[in-house]
């Protein structure tokens, strides 16, 4: 029964993650316009996201353009794009995975089989995880450069957006709940000891891998 | 208009100290980051030292580090560089720079010092 | 350190040539690229910042494209007033440092 609520806790995190991802990797947010200049009356703020930049007027009035031409983007933004989008999808056969092996579907009868497919989720949402992961932090990264290097101009300085967070959020949360459904499998997805085992060595408890036996530390 | 008059120069012994002076005018002297960059006899230019707006932050190259100092009056708009223990390739027109808000890179320069380091 | 190679080391072409000075990084420097013109007998000028933008003032003749770790000057129409020295320098990390320069002059 808690290996069945651990599994519920674990999907309903991938699906939060997944949720933040998607909108991590809508939002134009991921770069915002630090003015820093003594000397400077800020008039607008500039939002940048992956597919579109933003001008909100001090008015509140926001007028947003999608970036025109693929390859005339920097090869950075296009391919924290790439790994946005990738992550999103894998996620999603993650999703599709668990409920292939889930305790509720049908869609696999033997116990084995859907211990596999539960664990394969996990590793596949750990994966997503760590996709949403490298964008967010390359951009993060070359903010912060940006930010204390000297010699680039405070007007081209930018400050972490909404987005970052929201993708460390989405990061944080397909790690967490692909972890959980990593060590909610039993590693022979018996959830008693096998009619073969008993025959054989009645006294043999059920071997199950207990959560300390994956290295989930590596993805958390 | 930005104004940045260098002075100081002068010819030195190796091991000796020299100090650089800029003097800037026409804007606002604590708002921006400013950097020397010296230009050697053969034409080369090579980055010597940043300092940040407020003076807290300054960047150099290791072929200066430990010998030249940077450093700032807010006060009298003022900019220094303090160099000791000199040697024959430090020889070079010092030019005094001036960052910008809008542009990246060394944006205002000043006319140039020549320090010669000759025994 | 990243070194910056720059070619050619002087160049000489006719008022009106479409002159292209190039500038390769050792590493990856991003955009974080400028260009520098610096005419006989006073201090270098900022030409170009981020690899590709203009300074304000600067002739619309001049511009800087990036393709890798290999960036490019180009004036479209060469002009008398353009004869000078031009660098490069990158601004990624410490040391910054310049390109070797280019004598630009005319025929």
């Known amino acids: 029964m808690a290996s069945a609520g651990m599994q519920i806790l674990g999907v309903v995190l991938t699906l939060l993650g997944w949720v933040n991802g998607l909108v991590s990797c809508a939002l134009p947010m991921w770069k915002v316009t630090a003015f820093i200049g003594n000397s400077i009356v800020v008039a607008q703020v500039v939002w940048e996201g992956l597919w579109m930049s933003c001008v909100v007027q001090s008015t509140g009035q926001m007028q947003c353009k999608v970036y025109d031409s693929l390859l005339a983007l920097p090869q950075d933004l296009q391919a924290a794009r790439a790994l946005c989008v990738i992550a999103l999808l894998v996620a999603l056969f993650g999703l599709l995975v668990y409920l292939a092996g889930a305790k509720c579907t049908t869609c696999v009868e033997e116990k084995d089989s859907k211990a596999r497919l539960v664990l394969t989720s996990g590793i596949v949402f750990v994966i997503s995880g760590v996709l949403t992961l490298i964008p967010v932090c390359w951009t993060a990264h070359a903010i912060i450069r940006d930010f204390y290097n000297p010699l680039v101009a405070e007007a081209q300085k930018r400050e972490l957006g909404a987005s970052l967070y929201l993708g460390w959020a989405a990061s944080g949360l397909l790690l967490l709940g692909g972890g959980l459904l990593c060590c909610t499998c039993p590693s022979g997805g018996s959830q008693g000891p096998s009619h073969y085992m008993a025959r054989y060595s009645t006294s043999a408890p059920a071997i199950s891998r207990g959560p300390s036996e994956y290295p989930t530390k590596n993805y958390v | 208009e930005v104004k940045l008059v260098e002075s100081g120069g002068g010819l030195v012994k190796p091991g000796g100290s020299l100090r650089l002076s800029c003097a800037a005018s026409?804007?606002?002297?604590?708002?921006?980051?400013m950097s020397w960059v010296r230009q050697t006899p053969a034409k080369r230019l090579e980055w010597v030292v940043t300092?940040?707006?407020?003076?807290?932050?300054?960047y150099y190259p290791d072929s200066v580090k430990g010998r030249f100092t940077i450093s700032r009056d807010n006060a009298k708009n003022t900019l220094y560089l303090q160099m000791s223990s000199l040697r024959a390739e430090d020889t070079a027109v010092y030019y005094c720079i001036r960052g910008d808000y809008r542009y990246d890179g060394f944006a205002y320069w000043g006319q140039g010092t020549l320090v010669t380091v000759s025994s | 350190d990243i070194q910056m190679t720059q070619s050619p080391s002087s160049l000489s072409a006719s008022v009106g040539d479409r002159v292209t000075i190039t500038c390769r990084a050792s590493?990856?420097?991003?955009?974080?690229l400028a260009w520098y013109q610096q005419k006989p007998g006073k201090s270098p000028q900022l030409l170009v910042y981020a690899s590709t933008l203009l300074v304000d003032g600067v002739p619309s003749r001049f511009s800087g494209s990036r393709s890798g770790t290999q960036f490019s000057l180009t004036i479209s129409s060469l002009q008398p007033e353009d004869v000078a020295r031009y660098y490069c320098?990158?601004?990624?990390?410490?040391?910054?440092?310049f390109g070797s320069g280019t004598k630009l002059e005319i025929k």
């Open positions: 320098q990158h601004y990624y990390s410490i040391p910054y440092t």
């Open positions: 300092i940040s707006s407020g003076g807290g932050r300054t």
């Open positions: 026409g804007f606002t002297f604590n708002y921006y980051t």
């Open positions: 590493e990856n420097i991003d955009s974080y």
